[in-house]
Interface confidence: low
Amino acid sequence: MGSAALEILGLVLCLVGWGGLILACGLPMWQVTAFLDHNIVTAQTTWKGLWMSCVVQSTGHMQCKVYDSVLALSTEVQAARALTVGAVLLAFVALFVTLAGAQCTTCVAPGPAKARVALTGGVLYLLCGLLALVPLCWFANIVVREFYDPSVPVSQKYELGAALYIGWAATALLMVGGGLLCCGAWVCTSRPDLSFPVKYSAPRRPTATGDYDKKNYV
């Protein structure tokens, strides 16, 4: 596969991953109440996210409440907020860096420098994935630990929410996409013949040997 194809595929995966990360960050379903044993009339499921908590009645009625004070939040929620938002912003920066290093753009002149810019974009997406993975795994660890903690009442136990799964899928896409971008950039630096389009010049006069200059041919 040519580097341009790797670049496009990598960028598409990273953009989808970025969208997934934004979705995971905003969704209130980082943890959901585990047990639904009660009367369907009054039964309710609690969702908790980074920014708000929601109570969903069995009737389908949902009531959400944005967390009032940042200082009142637990350390893990504050840290998860910072890391997730950081990852989203880093992905935004990575997008511009990747576009600047892309073969189809003219922000940076073609050559090794452009390939290095593209490589930087790929690395940034990899970092973005790793950065997002930290709060996701941290949160999951807390939920699982509390689920098996005998000091937490049965009715107060939570399970992993949809947002965590979306987040994990998003980080996987970011890291795979970032990896493809890095591969594409590496191909550019190591095999220029597979990357930048050849600029053909007008044919020269035949050489003394009668052969055409072969430098423009693979």
């Epitope: 639904l36 000091s151 009442p153 049965v154």
Partner: antibody
Framework: EVQLVESGGGLVQPKGSLKLSCAAS????????MHWVRQAPGKGLEWVAR??????????YYVDSVKDRFIISRDDSQSMLYLQVNNLKTEDTAMYYC???????????WGQGTTLTVSS | DIVMSQSPSSLPVSVGQKVTMTCKSS????????????LAWYQQKPGQSPKLLIY???TRESGVPDRFTGSGSGTDFTLTISSVKAEDLAIYYC????????FGGGTRLEIK
Amino acid sequence: EVQLVESGGGLVQPKGSLKLSCAASGFTFNIYAMHWVRQAPGKGLEWVARIRSKSSNYATYYVDSVKDRFIISRDDSQSMLYLQVNNLKTEDTAMYYCVREGNWDCFDYWGQGTTLTVSS
Amino acid sequence: DIVMSQSPSSLPVSVGQKVTMTCKSSQSLLYTSNQKNYLAWYQQKPGQSPKLLIYWASTRESGVPDRFTGSGSGTDFTLTISSVKAEDLAIYYCQQYYRYHTFGGGTRLEIK
């Protein structure tokens, strides 16, 4: 009106077996966790076993003294709760109550009880 | 396991008198995340099944007369009957549902 009616109690010899039943009506049985609580003659209440709803994979819990001897089960289609009691001991003699775990996690409805007597 | 202790085991009272019975748990029943105490009180009249009176340590079950009041937090709880009536003759049990379910030994309310 919520009703829990126990049956199946009786006189059993030590090491014997029996199956206690509880017929539930007046509520959506399949979404509630259900329990068995017993009361020895002249004594206090002792929680015996719990079975959760289908949404919780029918998870079961037992008091240590009856683990490996008692089996709690349910049939949601019939709104029935069961307690299979095996390898009975004289100390299992008690009134056995079928109980619903209500919306506040505690026991909001109790049956009238069925008496199990273990004696040789 | 959480152990529940009730005192007194027997409480002779006169009709109209105010009574208080206590319940202690071997570990805190307060869950800080929701600020709820996982404790309930039940009344068992002679020859009858137990009946839920109070849950979350202080919330009266619907239909329970307001002379019954639950209070306390953490490990120490009380049930108060502001003015005892003859029909209150019963055994009162506290129960923790913080970690599975354990009952106290009961307090027998006897009318003098």
